[in-house]
Interface confidence: low
């Protein structure tokens, strides 16, 4: 198809050579096609434009990108030819950072229903270089991580050496969104939940005498809570006598909840004392039962094939242990009577 | 989809050494990063080491440090932990790993894509 009458966009993606970064580019089809056609979601049934050229499927992934060869051979369609490249609805990710990711890339409806949609496509020309400037030695991580029910910011890596006074006016968006209220380089978020967590990309336009372009660069966001400054706590046993049958195999359980740690190495283990001897027992696997953003439940049993006389004088012990500290619980067998 | 085959594993003495290899299927898998879990009897999976999808980038556990290197061969599909100076506490099952995204904190925190764990035991 003619790409004569695509709008075009310049831009610009800096990589640092220190870390891995990822990069988005977004179908930026000239409104109201964009409204309807990438993101519906933010239009009201009262918004919806009176004339829409686009009558494609509301299928949001409906638009087919591709990259113009410098050579000037035909586009090439981008799923086709390149891996490292990944299509998400009206967005392409570049999942590795590389000068040879710069060129030309074209996004159009794959559904052309009427003349006006011939015309509607974007060409986006992507220039890609590693950073040189080693002035800015401390600039912000394309990974950011947010404590989860503090404050907490995000920063622009590409602006994160520019006081917040000499910054240019930054477009953010989030998961594809825009945040039309951040307009700073950094944006202040009061209390961290888990929602702040996602895809941000910051954009600023930069001009010389010639031409002007946009500076992007995307932010890895995680919430996260802060390692625990507890020793774990055991659950079960909660008694420390237990009433059990002679002759009987017997299966006791202890499960501990262990606090988040980044570097977690969690400890469980069952050991007996019988007099003044102690050893620990070969007991089956421990394993987590459950999982959450802030604290792990790890079980691990001890299994006597069959209670015996000589048990019920020893102490069975569980043991657990963290980065914090230590905790155990013992338990004594006592016949059941009757 | 990557799908993870893990070798090399087996009984070794102690101060001995192993080279352990996972094989990648999938176009994609020059995209990822790639890494090394254990998990010993009795305690969770643990993280191991790391590399970048390019390989520039490598990260290690304070425990493995100087001990394991871990490289790769995108020609190839396949990733690599050479373990030298092993000791009976590396005992374990070990699971290669692939994730879209690598920052050394990050890495196993949404892992994309698990083998199923070949085992390395270390005798005294």
């Known amino acids: 198809f003619n790409i004569s009458g695509c709008s075009t966009k310049k831009l610009l993606w800096t990589y640092s050579t220190r870390s891995e970064e990822e990069f988005v580019l977004f179908c930026d089809l000239p409104e109201p096609q964009k409204s309807h056609f990438c993101h519906r979601n933010r239009l009201s049934p009262k918004q919806v434009p009176e004339h829409l050229p686009f009558m494609g499927s509301n299928d949001l992934s409906d638009v087919q990108w591709y990259q113009q060869p410098s050579n000037g051979d035909p586009l090439e369609d981008i799923r086709k030819s390149y891996p490292h490249i990944i299509q998400d609805k009206c967005t392409l990710h570049f999942l590795t950072p590389g000068v040879n990711n710069s060129g030309s890339y074209i996004c159009r409806p794959k559904m052309i229903k009427s003349p006006y949609d011939v015309a509607c496509c974007v060409k986006m020309i992507l220039e890609v270089k590693p950073q040189t400037n080693a002035s800015c030695e401390y600039s912000a991580s394309h990974k950011q991580d947010l404590l989860l029910g503090s404050t907490g910011s995000i920063s622009c890596p590409s602006l994160s050496c520019q006081s917040d006074a000499q910054s240019p006016a930054v477009t953010w968006y989030k998961n594809g969104k825009l945040l039309s209220v951040e307009r700073s380089n950094r944006i202040v978020v009061d209390e961290v939940y888990d929602y702040h967590q996602g895809t941000y990309v910051c954009d600023y336009t930069q001009s010389d005498t010639v031409s002007s372009w946009t500076v992007r660069a995307v932010v890895q966001v995680r919430t996260i809570v802060g390692d625990t400054k507890l020793k774990p706590d055991i659950l079960d046993p909660v008694e420390d006598t237990l009433e059990v049958e002679l002759g009987k195999p017997l299966t006791i359980s202890c499960k501990a909840r262990f606090g988040f740690e980044r570097v977690f190495n969690p400890v469980i283990k069952w050991y007996i004392k019988d007099s003044d001897l102690e050893w620990e027992v070969s007991v089956p696997e421990a394993k987590s039962i459950k999982s959450t953003l802030k604290d792990e439940i790890i079980e691990r049993n001890i299994i006597l094939e069959k209670v015996t006389q000589r048990d019920l004088r020893r102490k069975f012990v569980c043991f657990v242990q963290n980065s914090i500290g230590n905790t155990t619980q013992s338990v004594q067998l006592k016949e059941k009577r009757g | 989809d990557v799908q993870l085959q893990e070798s090399g594993g087996g009984l070794v003495q102690a101060g001995g050494s192993l080279r352990l290899s996972c094989a990648a299927s999938?176009?994609?898998?020059?995209?990822?990063?790639m890494g090394w879990f254990r998990q010993a009897p009795g305690m969770v999976r643990e993280f191991v080491a790391a590399?970048?999808?390019?390989?520039?980038?490598?990260y290690y556990a304070d425990s493995v440090q100087g001990r394991f290197t871990i490289s790769r061969d995108n020609a190839k599909n396949t990733v690599y932990l050479q373990m030298n100076s092993l000791k009976p506490e590396d005992t374990a099952v070990y699971y290669c790993?692939?994730?879209?995204?690598?920052?050394?904190?990050?890495?196993?925190?949404?892992?994309?894509?698990w083998g199923q764990g070949t085992q390395v035991t270390v005798s005294s």
């Open positions: 590399i970048s999808w390019s390989g520039g980038s490598t």
């Open positions: 999938g176009r994609t898998f020059s995209s990822y990063a």
């Open positions: 790993a692939a994730d879209r995204s690598l920052s050394g904190s990050y890495f196993g925190a949404t892992i994309d894509y």
